[in-house]
Every structure is written in C-alpha cells, then in structure tokens.
C-alpha cells in the first residue's frame, strides 16, 4: 500500500461567462472498478462540498442534474468544468478523490485550484 | 450544530447479538461518510467500520469483519450497527464519527457502552 | 494496514511548558490524512489537527501539527491546565484506518 497523490493546477481564471475547467490527476495505488470525486470549495477557512460524483472506471462520470459541475473521466485523470460562476465565488476549490472499491479504500486530496473569477462589466448603452 | 448520539448499547452474553444505532443531526447525512469506532476499558482508539454516503460501500476492521455489519437510513439521518456472535473482547465504548470533508473524523458521538459477559 | 507508533506513551510536564508529541507510521502516510485527537476521561475524542498541520474549528493555535512521509509531530507551545489529556494520531488515507496507541500527558 501507498498513499494516492492528488495533482491540480495552482491557478485557474474563469471565462468571462464564469466557466472554469481544470484537470484533477491522481496515481492510483490500486486497481479501482469504482473512485468518487468531490469538489470542495475553502475560503475564510469555511469548507463546502460544490459537487460530487462516483463512476466506474471506463464509464463517465456523472453528476446530479442540479449540479454546476461536468466532467469527463480518462484512466486517472478527471476534467473538471465548474459553471455559473460570479465573482463571489473566488476561491481554493480542492479535487478529493475516493477509491470506494474493491477495498482497500484509499483517500486523496489535492492542494487545491485558486479560480478567480471577475463578474464582466455591464455594457455601456451607445449613442449613434 | 452537528450532533451524533448513539443507543442501543447493553450488557449481553458471548454469542449474542446487539444492535448500535446513531441519530444524526445538523449536517448533510447523506454527504459524510459515517464510522464506528470503539475503545475497550482503559485502552486505546479501534477503528472498527466505515459506511460511505448512499450506503454501497462499507468497509470493516479484520475483527470484526463477518459479525458486524454497518448500514445507514439517509431519509431517517441515522446509522446502525449490527453485532453478532459477540466475544468478551467486543466489551467497549462505542462512537460513531462523521467523516469531515477532508476525511478525518471531525464530529463524535458520546459513545454507548457494550459489555459481552457470562 | 498502517501501523502507527506513538512516543513517548506518557510525559509529565507542568503548565507551561512546552509539549512534543511525536507519531511514526510504519509507511508513507499522505499528509493530507494524518490526524491528531484529544481524549479526556469519560469523553469522546476531540479533533484537533487534521491534513498533518492544519488546526480544526476552535482549536486554540497553541497547537500545532507537523510532519510528512513517516514522522508526524503535535506541538502544544505552553500547556493550559487542560490540555493535560491522552493524544492519538490517525491515518486515513488507507482502509484500515489505523490509530496510534496514544501519548498521554500528565502534569508533573
């Protein structure tokens, strides 16, 4: 057994239509048919769940309909897409990733994305 | 504020059964994966079962594993261990802990005490 | 499983002074999932540091945790009379979760 390492960019900028992506890697220990991976947002050491979604490996992931998030799956590697996104929602957003099965279980939790998010300027009404 | 209490606990006979539960309040159930732990007399921490989130996965300690099973009510926020062919060093304390975000045990029951004895 | 070894398994001190609770793993641990709790008599465990050094909710910052790979190390820089309790360091970055046998520290 070792531990599972956890990979994230530092830094991401969302669009200016508030979409943010990034990649969240890991090295997997072991041979898992099932891993669940959960967003978390940290800001004035407040911690959040954004979303969550568990997959079988070879399948998509798949989040709740409700959810802001989307991703896709391939091998280790989870892409990330977090929408509706405003400014408010600058934050530390931590990629944790869960080896649910088969046992043994294995935790790992990235050092976490800084997305910043900037609300676009209203556009100012033209005179012709 | 987040809660956890836990009932069931008792003074049973080796070979018995006994059925823990943990009511949960405050929090997202269905969000934390929920463990038991337990401590014999004067002795240290045992983590003894793991139930993750909707319930399909569990996770047991090697003493226990094959006598105890873990499941979980998400609609009633409360968990439950099953103990069967209970043994003399079964007799603990036994907690239940949520599972924090970033997977330590961050909220603890008060524990409810279990006494296998002839 | 991850065998966890505490030292030392007690240590008097008087108020004041300073505390070094040292936990070796007998592998890598994660330091993302190296924990430390408070137990006193009669009570349930108290989370106190988790990720190897950062501090949970309402923990005073006189305590601190530290750490990588197999040698973690709780800190308590002047003890307060109640501070004088058992400490255990957890890992759970690997099922089985494992606990340390505990260090407990008395007052001298």
């Known amino acids: 057994c070792k531990a599972m390492h956890v990979a994230q960019p530092a830094v991401v900028l969302a669009s200016s239509r508030g979409i943010a992506s990034f990649v969240c890697e890991y090295a997997s220990p072991g041979k898992a048919t099932e891993v669940r991976v959960t967003v978390l947002r940290q800001a004035d050491s407040q911690v959040t769940e954004v979303c969550a979604a568990t997959y079988m490996m070879g399948n998509e992931l798949t989040f709740l309909d409700d959810s802001i998030c989307t991703g896709t799956s391939s091998g280790n590697q989870v892409n990330l897409t977090i929408q509706g996104l405003r400014a408010m929602d600058t934050g530390l957003y931590i990629c944790k990733v869960e080896l649910m099965y088969p046992p043994p279980y294995y935790l790992g939790i990235g050092n976490g994305t800084q997305i910043y998010v900037i609300d676009p300027e209203p556009c100012p009404d033209s005179d012709f | 504020q987040v809660q956890l209490v836990e009932s069931g606990g008792g003074v049973v006979q080796p070979g018995s059964s006994l059925r823990l539960s943990c009511a949960a309040s405050g929090f997202t159930f269905s969000s934390h994966g929920m463990h038991w732990v337990r401590q014999a007399p004067g002795k240290g921490l045992e983590w003894v079962a793991v139930i993750w989130y909707d319930g399909s996965n569990k996770h047991y300690a090697d003493s226990v594993k094959g006598r105890f099973t873990t499941s979980r009510d998400n609609s009633k926020n409360t968990l439950h261990l099953q103990m069967n062919s209970l043994r003399a060093e079964d007799t603990a304390v036994y907690f239940c802990?949520?599972?924090?975000?970033?997977?330590?045990?961050?909220?603890w029951g008060q524990g409810t005490l279990v006494t296998v004895s002839s | 499983e991850i065998v966890l070894t505490q030292s030392p398994g007690t240590l008097s001190l008087s108020p004041g002074e300073r505390a070094t609770l040292s936990c070796r793993a007998s592998q890598s641990v994660s330091s993302s999932c190296l924990a430390w709790y408070q137990q006193k008599p009669g009570q349930a465990p108290r989370l106190l540091i988790y990720g190897a050094s950062s501090r949970a909710t309402g923990i005073p910052d006189r305590f601190s945790g530290s750490g990588s790979g197999t040698d973690f190390t709780l800190t308590i820089s002047r003890l307060e009379p109640e501070d004088f309790a058992v400490y255990y360091c957890q890992q759970y970055g690997i099922s089985p979760f494992t606990f340390g046998p505990g260090t407990k520290v008395d007052i001298k």
């Open positions: 802990a949520r599972g924090g975000y970033f997977g330590c045990f961050d909220y």
